[in-house]
């Protein structure tokens, strides 16, 4: 069945309560536009927004009986002549009569006669028609001609994008048959389709079509009042490919729209052929798109690649929701034209600081007020990380103008990254040289506290990302965050007393859910002792407040649980609702602080493994009294077990060679390579493809390289555990970008910079030490539990 | 074809106004923009300003802003600029061009030389 | 005085190739598109080259122009005596909100 057929078949379905054979239609109010009725909408009650009145009509090809509900009789069946009386359009019929056409359309053959509705003729330039009946015999005779093909064609087979040569010349009829049952002959839109008669079919349109003798390019270049767009065309190289074949839809803006837009941003543009030729494409569809098919908002791809949406407002036509059109349907040998007062401007001809919307203003007056807008060079390559208005409070609108640029300053980019090419570890580097970290999780992507909102673009020069906050690169570590703040005095204490204080200072992606003091009201000194006389229940529980991984609360898909793996081993559930962060359904009092090395969520109260049984009477006790939110298992005599610490402490212990490194004489500023054969290693990473985080798997060679500079330096690895003392010779050069360690059990992984600094320490020159020894270095963390 | 036909050399004296008149003809007026540059003796080309022939809205040169006015007669196709408070450097020959933004200053007038000598 | 800077003068011989340059800053050659004008002696100035490099119809092919950055430049080649003229180079000028000219260069067929 075709679109046509279907709607028509709802209007069936939807009129037969007032009996048989009833098509409901509906009616734009103060306009005399029907259509039938599809899905859509009927349960909307509007048509191009705008209220419809439901009419019952009698379905194409049945009439009404006299005393009987609904249309239980069938049209009489006459040749097309008789036909054009039957479907009411009797002045094409008159026009058939007196123009010699009838004994045509009386007599044998099969025709399919597009017949203007009576409605139609009155709305036609009254010159054209006064032409058309001085001169019968030859111009309303080719005029009616044209509207005619010389075969029956019902809408079924009316398909999209066919061309049909009528009985005038061979001249083309160019049929749409639209999604919505809209089916247009050059742009005139099919009202009562399908009457058959014995000689044919007859289909009612909505306007009498005129002869098509032009192209797309011939009209611009006719056209005085489109020589802008005519000379722009020519610019980028387009006017003569709108000579073409095609099914062009061209939003043609006028002169006076190119008067409207600012002259210094038509001059940019004009002086680039890459903006000035996606200018033009983004007027342009590769779709024939009539007017009378537009009754409601459609979304459509340009010949630039980017969208439009094409919608309706009564009789008027709007583009991307600004009515613009005002000349509608100027149908070509190739497409149709709509004249526009507004030239479209698609986000890859615009400078990134224009990409900016209506919510960030206030960062973009702020760029242009702090002189960085300068900054940003038309033929360089940026990113805006544009935090919306109302991120910006009145303390931060107020601040001195020099810390206001600083901040400023961390949210543009010196390169321009898209959507696509962000992941989860990515570091970004600011104009003002900071260092942004990239947290990429299942339903949000984050730059270090700032989870983005929709509506990323990509523009000539850059790209602009929209952030829910201002970005606030981190400056301490977890350690020295929670040492600078006194709520977290006993929490610390304890921390220390377990021997964990290096695991929060040195480098690494961690979440700690940091208990406040509140969180040991009422402990004892004596119970305190107590805790901390078991060093192994001490760093079980501290332990469980620290996950891998850096899951920022805003970053967690609302009301949903994620389940994540402590480093003591055991799950700890988060859900964030009503922008809080439940942290195993206890209300988070503060989160989203970002450190160096990881994030710290603040609760004020202790958390607790509800998997781990106590075995000490006075443990249980004192955990009873600090946690009430669980029930703690108690097991007599069941004991804490131990969390090898080597796990997180960094120790350089054993390297693996597998055959001797090479190594040569080098000249000043050449780079050495020195190759360490090792297993492959496996690397797994989160990137956004096309809006989607997609998890990577990366297989390395077997060949690890380390870049190496001219200027040699000695470092001295010392092995542990008892081994014999040997070192390596010349391992390292210069300053190492890239190393890479092969971990036993573990994944491969990048040094950050300071354990490289730790690395790059010793000059005392050692001997070789033999192959298939290895370096037991900090064993990586598992991903597991990144349920984000 | 296209043409651009100005009035007449005008000699003021330092303080008066000028207006001089640009008809043009062969075109669709109202399609197009009309920009006025003037040229002073032996000098180099400045930029004076814009109108929309079709909606009269206008874009001055900063350095004569609130001294210059252009307005357009769509009925007789005139574009016209109106200089006040003339000053002796502001001899020039003074030209109309059509201004079709996509591309500047496609045809010329023939200029008018306004003389200003007390 | 002109924003942006022209040599005052080029010369060569018929036939040869002359080329005309154009400096000027990020606010206007940097950023915006680049315009060229011939001026006869005693006549108006003449539309010869908009948009860095497209030639308006009419426009010999042996005018040609191009544009790197802050600078543009209008090379005219197989010189002829009709070409002695003026050269102007003009651009938008986003700090000042203006269209400016060069300060012009004569070119002299010898």
């Known amino acids: 069945n075709s679109y046509y057929d279907k709607v028509l078949a709802h209007s069936r379905i939807r009129g037969r309560d007032q009996g048989p054979n009833v098509c409901a239609l509906q009616q734009i109010l103060g306009t005399k536009k029907k259509y039938f009725s599809s899905c859509k909408n009927w349960y909307q009650g509007a048509i191009c927004g705008k209220k419809t009145t439901v009419l019952y009509e009698c379905c194409p090809g049945y009439m009404r009986m006299e005393g009987m509900k609904g249309c239980p009789a069938v049209m009489p069946i006459d040749h097309v002549y008789g036909t054009l009386g039957i479907v009411g359009a009797t002045t094409t019929q008159h026009y058939s009569d007196v123009s010699k056409l009838r004994e045509e359309i009386e007599g044998k053959g099969s025709y399919t006669y597009f017949a203007p509705s009576n409605e139609a003729w009155e709305n036609l330039d009254s010159d054209i028609r006064r032409g058309l009946e001085n001169n019968v015999n030859v111009e309303l005779l080719n005029a009616l001609h044209s509207h005619m093909v010389n075969k029956r064609m019902l809408t079924k087979d009316l398909k999209h994008g066919m061309v049909i040569p009528s009985m005038y010349n061979n001249l083309g009829l160019f049929i749409n048959h639209y999604p919505n049952g809209v089916v247009t002959v050059n742009c005139a839109r099919v009202i009562h389709g399908n009457q058959i008669a014995t000689n044919g079919v007859v289909h009612v349109i909505d306007r009498v079509l005129t002869q098509i003798g032009t192209s797309i390019q011939d009209f611009l270049e006719a056209e005085d009042d489109l020589s802008s767009f005519r000379a722009a065309a020519i610019t980028s190289d387009l006017l003569e490919s709108l000579g073409r074949d095609g099914h062009f839809t061209l939003f043609a803006p006028t002169n006076e729209a190119f008067e409207k837009l600012p002259r210094g941003v038509l001059e940019r543009i004009m002086g680039d052929k890459v903006a000035s030729e996606a200018l033009m494409k983004y007027h342009i569809l590769n779709t024939l798109q009539c007017s009378e098919a537009i009754t409601g908002g459609a979304v459509f791809e340009t010949m630039e690649g980017n969208t439009i949406e094409i919608g309706c407002e009564g009789d008027s036509i709007s583009i991307n929701g600004i009515k613009m059109v005002n000349k509608k349907d100027i149908v070509t040998k190739n497409g149709v034209i709509h004249l526009i007062d507004e030239v479209l401007i698609p986000d890859s001809a615009k400078q990134v600081i224009e990409l900016a919307g209506k919510q960030q203003t206030t960062f973009t007056d702020l760029v242009a007020q702090l002189g960085l807008a300068s900054s940003l060079k038309p033929d360089g390559e940026y990113t805006l990380l544009a935090p919306v208005n109302n991120a910006f409070s009145d303390d931060t609108l107020s601040m001195d103008q020099r810390l206001l640029k600083l901040i400023l300053q961390n949210h543009i980019l010196k390169v321009k990254v898209g959507l696509s090419d962000l992941y989860n570890g990515q570091i970004l580097e600011t104009i003002g040289g900071k260092q942004l970290r990239v947290f990429v999780y299942r339903t949000a992507i984050c730059i270090e506290n700032s989870c983005m909102v929709r509506g990323s673009k990509q523009g000539r020069n850059g790209a602009i990302h929209i952030f829910r906050e201002i970005i606030q690169p981190a400056e301490k570590s977890l350690h020295d965050k929670l040492r600078q703040d006194k709520r977290f005095s006993i929490f610390l204490s304890l921390l220390e007393a377990a021997d964990l204080k290096d695991l929060l200072t040195q480098p690494g992606d961690w979440t700690l859910f940091a208990p406040t003091n509140d969180a040991f009201k009422g402990m004892t000194s004596e119970e305190r002792e107590l805790l901390i006389g078991d060093k192994n229940a001490l760093q079980n529980i501290i332990l469980y407040h620290l996950t891998p991984g850096v899951y920022i609360g805003k970053g967690f898909e609302p009301g949903v649980t994620n389940i994540l793996k402590t480093t003591q081993g055991s799950k700890i559930y988060l859900k964030g609702v009503n922008e809080t962060l439940l942290v195993n359904e206890l209300k988070s009092k503060e989160s989203d602080i970002m450190t160096t090395n990881g994030v710290i969520h603040v609760v004020d109260k202790l958390l607790y493994p509800a998997d781990i049984p106590v075995g000490n009477d006075q443990l249980l006790e004192l955990l009873n009294k600090l946690i009430k939110y669980i029930q703690i298992k108690f097991v007599r005599g069941s004991t804490f077990k131990e969390i090898p610490m080597t796990v997180y402490r960094p120790a350089m212990t054993k390297i693996q060679i597998e055959g001797d490194p090479d190594f040569r004489l080098i000249k000043e500023g050449e780079t050495v390579t020195e190759v360490i054969h090792g297993e492959p290693v496996i690397k797994k990473y989160t990137k956004i493809i096309d809006g989607v985080p997609v998890e990577i798997t990366e297989k390395q060679t077997r060949e690890e390289r380390i870049i190496t500079g001219p200027e040699i330096k000695y470092t001295r690895i010392s092995t542990g555990g008892g081994e014999t003392g040997e070192t390596l010779q010349k391992f390292l050069q210069k300053e190492v970008s890239k190393v890479t360690k092969f971990i036993e059990g573990g994944d491969g992984h990048l040094f950050e910079d300071e354990e490289i600094k730790r690395l790059l320490q010793g000059d005392t020159p050692a001997k070789k030490i033999p192959a298939n020894k290895r370096v037991q270095g900090p064993r990586r963390r598992s991903r597991e539990g990144r349920s984000q | 074809q296209v043409q651009l036909v100005q009035s007449g050399a005008e000699v003021k004296k330092p303080g008066a106004s000028v207006k001089v008149s640009c008809k043009a003809s062969g075109y669709t007026f109202t399609s197009y923009g009309i920009s006025w540059v003037r040229q002073a003796p032996g000098q180099g080309l400045e930029w004076m300003g814009w109108?929309?022939?079709?909606?009269?809205?206008?874009n001055y040169a900063q350095k004569l802003q609130g001294r210059v006015t252009m307005t357009t007669d769509t009925s007789t196709s005139t574009a016209y600029m109106e200089l006040r408070s003339l000053r002796s450097d502001d001899t020039a020959v003074y030209y109309c061009?059509?201004?079709?933004?996509?591309?500047?200053?496609?045809?010329w007038g023939q200029g008018t030389l306004v003389t200003v000598s007390s | 005085q002109s924003v942006l800077t022209q040599s005052s003068s080029a010369s060569g011989t018929p036939g040869q190739t002359v080329t005309v340059s154009c400096s000027g800053s990020?606010?206007?050659?940097?950023?915006?598109?680049v315009n060229w004008y011939q001026q006869l002696p005693g006549t108006a100035p003449k539309l010869l080259i908009y948009?860095?490099?497209q030639r308006p119809s009419g426009v010999p092919d042996r005018f040609s122009g191009s544009k790197s950055g802050t600078s543009a430049s209008l090379a005219i080649s197989g010189l002829q005596s009709a070409d002695e003229a003026d050269y102007y180079c003009?651009?938008?000028?986003?700090?000042?909100?203006?269209?400016?000219f060069g300060s012009g260069t004569k070119v002299t067929v010898l």
């Open positions: 109108i929309s022939a079709y909606q009269g809205n206008t």
């Open positions: 003009a651009a938008w000028d986003d700090s000042l909100s203006t269209y400016v």
């Open positions: 990020s606010s206007d050659i940097g950023s915006n598109r």
């Open positions: 948009s860095n490099d």
């Open positions: 061009a059509r201004d079709m933004l996509v591309v500047p200053f496609d045809y």
